[in-house]
């Protein structure tokens, strides 16, 4: 014959445990129902009556099946350096995490207790190890041939731009400045050449500009990508 299904409360068989979502009440010495997440035990069970559950009040929660007499209080509101990534509901606590540009200096079980701003690497230094949710940025001096001209928690040291002729050599905090060359048209592969910003990175730089043997006028080239100069008639 099939075993009889026991309804809570019931006395467990000697040596056996209560079923899933039930708990053993020491006072009543019975297996009783747990309350579902978002509820708490308003009245504990007896030998003849099961647990009476009630919903959690505002700003309180229970996340698990439980038989607690009171719901847990949600954590305090997130501070200005944090963002609320999970709201306080009857079934879950509020979770605060650090906002962009900050990292968690002191964590708690869920979320962060104390946020701190990510370190910014000053010019001449670049990011060696980026910041994470729980670790600060690590900066390093830019190696010869590389530079960083920003104060930033994300910028790495970048190679100096390649120059045909170096006007101002780069250093750790400044890209090289190039002088454009102006050869005769027969030496160019195409019809017209415009002064053009150039860049990529040097491995090794001496602190002196180069002598330019280029005929005609020379232009200092701006750094970084941009379109050719308007109305220019060539190098």
């Amino acid at each position: 014959l099939p075993a009889q299904v026991a309804f809570t409360p019931y006395a467990p068989e000697p040596g056996s445990t209560c079923r899933l979502r039930e708990y053993y009440d020491q006072t009543a010495q019975m297996c009783c129902s747990k309350c579902s997440p978002g509820q708490h035990a308003k009245v504990f069970c007896t030998k003849t009556s099961d647990t009476v559950c009630d919903s959690c009040e505002d700003s309180t929660y229970t996340q698990l099946w439980n038989w607690v007499p009171e719901c847990l209080s949600c954590g305090s509101r997130c501070s200005s350096d944090q963002v609320e990534t999970q709201a306080c509901t009857r079934e879950q606590n509020r979770i605060c995490t650090c906002r962009p540009g900050w990292y968690c200096a002191l964590s708690k079980q869920e979320g962060c207790r104390l946020c701190a701003p990510l370190r910014k690497c000053r010019p001449g230094f670049g990011v060696a190890r980026p910041g994470t949710e729980t670790s600060d940025v690590v900066c390093k001096p830019c190696a010869p041939g590389t530079f960083s001209n920003t104060t930033s928690s994300t910028d790495i040291c970048r190679p100096h731009q390649i120059c045909n002729v170096v006007a101002i050599p780069g250093n750790a905090s400044m890209d090289a400045v190039c002088t454009s060359t102006s050869p005769t048209r027969s030496m160019a592969p195409g019809a017209v050449h415009l002064p053009q910003p150039v860049s990529t990175r040097s491995q090794h730089t001496q602190p002196t500009p180069e002598p330019s043997t280029a005929p005609s006028t020379s232009f200092l080239l701006p750094m970084g990508p941009s379109p050719p100069a308007e109305g220019s008639t060539g190098d």
Epitope: G145, N164, G170, P183, Q196, V198, S199, T200
Partner: antibody, heavy 120, light 111 residues
Framework: EVQLLESGGGLVQPGGSLRLSCAAS????????MHWVRQAPGKGLEWVSA????????YYADSVKGRFTISRDNSKNTLYLQMNSLRAEDTAVYYC?????????????WGQGTLVTVSS | QSVLTQPPSASGTPGQRVTISCTGS?????????VHWYQQLPGTAPKLLIY???QRPSGVPDRFSGSKSGTSASLAISGLRSEDEADYYC???????????FGGGTKLTVL
């Protein structure tokens, strides 16, 4: 007419050294960055190294940094690549190339190439 | 693995128009840097085909044209001829690397 002529390639054992040369003519050599670009057998192009026109600044790919040295002699219109601690993966045709006018990130003229074979 | 991505092969019949793509990222093409194209005929050294996205060196037929948009560029060859059978490489400057970066190359076959 712009001409670039490489020489110095050959067979070398792993760990050995080789010096490549590139003789340039037909343009104002000292006004242009010069580059070395290589091509392993059956593979694509890989930029290796560059040097500014006045030879004050040199540039290297990470794969050769510390092993290769680029230099130039503007009085002789010649570009060099000293290759030390050679590895099997350095086997390639090595081309010298002239930086473009106003923008050294393109190569408007190339040499015919010289083959470097690193093998025991 | 090349920094710039090209299809390994392309083909077309004589007279057709073919396009070869070159896809980069925000540190190279997408950073505003120019794209250059090289043609390498079998057994020869590479030759500059297109520079600064769409400029043709003297001597390059106007059948070859280049364009750039966002993080990618393309080379178009119209009126395909048998002598166009070659490897084509794109190249650009990259913010984080010391020199120009190349695509892996596209082998163009004229059927």
């Amino acid at each position: 007419e712009v001409q670039l002529l490489e020489s110095g390639g050959g067979l070398v054992q792993p760990g050995g050294s080789l010096r490549l040369s590139c003789a340039a003519s037909g343009f104002t050599f000292s006004s242009y960055a010069m580059h070395w670009v290589r091509q392993a057998p059956g593979k694509g192009l890989e930029w290796v190294s560059a040097i500014s026109g006045g030879a004050t600044t040199t540039y290297y790919a990470d794969s050769v940094k510390g092993r290769f040295t680029i230099s130039r002699d503007n009085s002789k219109n010649t570009l060099y690549l000293q290759m030390n601690s050679l590895r099997a993966e350095d086997t390639a045709v090595y081309y010298c190339a002239k930086g473009g006018t106003g923008d050294p990130y393109y190569f408007d003229y190339w040499g015919q190439g010289t083959l470097v074979t690193v093998s025991s | 693995q090349s920094v710039l991505t090209q299809p390994p092969s392309a083909s077309g019949t004589p007279g057709q128009r073919v396009t070869i793509s070159c896809t980069g990222s925000s540190s190279n093409i997408g950073a505003g840097y120019d794209v250059h194209w090289y043609q390498q005929l079998p057994g020869t050294a590479p030759k500059l085909l297109i520079y600064r996205n769409n400029q043709r060196p003297s001597g390059v037929p106007d059948r070859f044209s280049g364009s750039k948009s966002g993080t990618s560029a393309s080379l178009a060859i119209s009126g395909l001829r048998s002598e166009d059978e070659a490897d084509y490489y794109c190249a650009a400057r990259d913010d984080g690397l010391s020199g120009p970066v190349f695509g892996g190359g596209t082998k163009l076959t004229v059927l």
